[in-house]
């Protein structure tokens, strides 16, 4: 029997025996199109597909709709995997979403959603979340019910303003809402009282811009 050489996500990579963190080539569901993703094979049992990472401000996250659709950055550093791939993947089966956060004081926290998926591009990659647990706030910092995705050239928020232009970055903005993990990266001692930083309100409050963030997904039945 021929060995499987295409993987849909990092959980399949892990189950095939590749248990080392790193960049792996994944294949779009029902397609031969490929995408490179970082796989975390250690945290919480491994098999996590990293869909977003911020850590040093080296990558500009004020990008277009198309760039957020296909992804940008470097999977070994700061990057966005791509809304189209994540949408297709999370509509194939049930996925969980884990968001890992670091502040500038050495603290870490996470939010875990037991069910996560993105609608199609026709529905503006609207985010759907259920079942929040974790240490980064008892209330979801991603507004519920989920909002459409917005970018600087694709304004789908509920604000009289254009949240993506005002806060920078593409995100599931409300008006504008309690979070934006794709905001401007601010260094230590310049990270408070920021109107457009990397925000997760129900952990660090208003105006606090985080040091590092990772968004990762894995099948619920892993």
């Amino acid at each position: 029997k021929e060995e499987q050489i295409s993987f849909r996500d990092c959980a399949e990579v892990f189950k095939s025996g590749h248990t080392t963190n790193g960049i792996y080539t994944l294949t779009f569901p029902n397609s031969t199109e490929e995408i490179k993703a970082y796989c975390d094979m250690e945290a919480g049992g491994g098999g996590w597909t990293i869909i977003q990472r911020r850590e040093d401000g080296s990558v500009d996250f004020q990008r277009t709709w198309k760039e957020y659709k296909v992804g940008f950055g470097n999977p070994s550093g700061e990057y966005w995997l791509g809304n189209e791939f994540v949408s297709q993947l999370t509509n194939q089966q049930r996925y969980v979403l884990k968001i890992h956060l670091k502040d500038w004081e050495g603290n870490e926290a996470y939010s875990l959603y037991e069910h996560f998926y993105l609608s199609s591009e026709e529905l503006n990659y609207r985010i759907h979340l259920k079942g929040l647990t974790g240490t980064a706030g008892k209330i979801s910092s991603i507004s519920q019910p989920g909002n459409d995705f917005s970018t600087k050239d694709g304004d789908n928020d509920k604000c009289i303003c254009k949240c993506s232009q005002m806060l920078t970055g593409g995100w599931w903005f409300d008006a504008c809402g309690p979070s934006n993990l794709n905001g401007m990266y601010y260094p230590q001692r310049q990270n408070t009282n920021k109107f457009n930083g990397i925000k997760w309100y129900y952990w660090k409050g208003s105006g606090y811009s985080l040091k590092a963030t990772t968004m990762m997904i894995r099948p619920a039945d892993f």
Partner: nanobody, 129 residues
């Protein structure tokens, strides 16, 4: 850098008055709304009053309507909260905070707490005889 500095707090007898000031720097009031919030020991932070300098719109919580007046002096980049007929239940640390004025949901007039991204350190108001 964005900074908000409150002043004017202190000890006052019931029925007395105080005027709090919120001096803003790093941005101009024209493009922002300023809110006054308060937090009493063991209680949640609550909105008291807010102003959008550009349109002159104001907001007051029911508990302070008719007693508190918010105003702004854009030339000084300062917002004031005139507090009259003070009651013991007004005792709290008072904070001012800023939000870009345009960050408004369609059909709404004011902003949820999490939209205020810049905060001062607070000034203590104690109402006691």
């Amino acid at each position: 850098d964005v900074q908000l500095v409150e002043s004017g707090g202190g000890l006052v007898q019931p029925g007395g008055s105080l005027r709090l000031s919120c001096a803003a720097s790093g941005f101009t009031l024209d493009d922002y709304a300023i809110g006054w919030f308060r937090q009493a020991p063991g209680k949640e932070r609550e909105g008291v009053s807010a102003i959008r300098s550009s349109g002159g719109s104001t907001y007051y919580a029911d508990s302070v309507k008719g007693r508190f007046t918010i105003s702004s002096d854009n030339s000084k980049n300062t917002v004031y909260l005139q507090m009259n007929s003070l009651r013991p239940e007004d005792t709290a640390v008072y904070y001012c905070a800023a939000v870009p004025a345009g960050r408004l949901r369609f059909g709404e007039q004011w902003y949820p707490l999490y939209e205020y991204d810049a905060w001062g350190q607070g000034t203590l108001v104690t109402v006691s005889s």
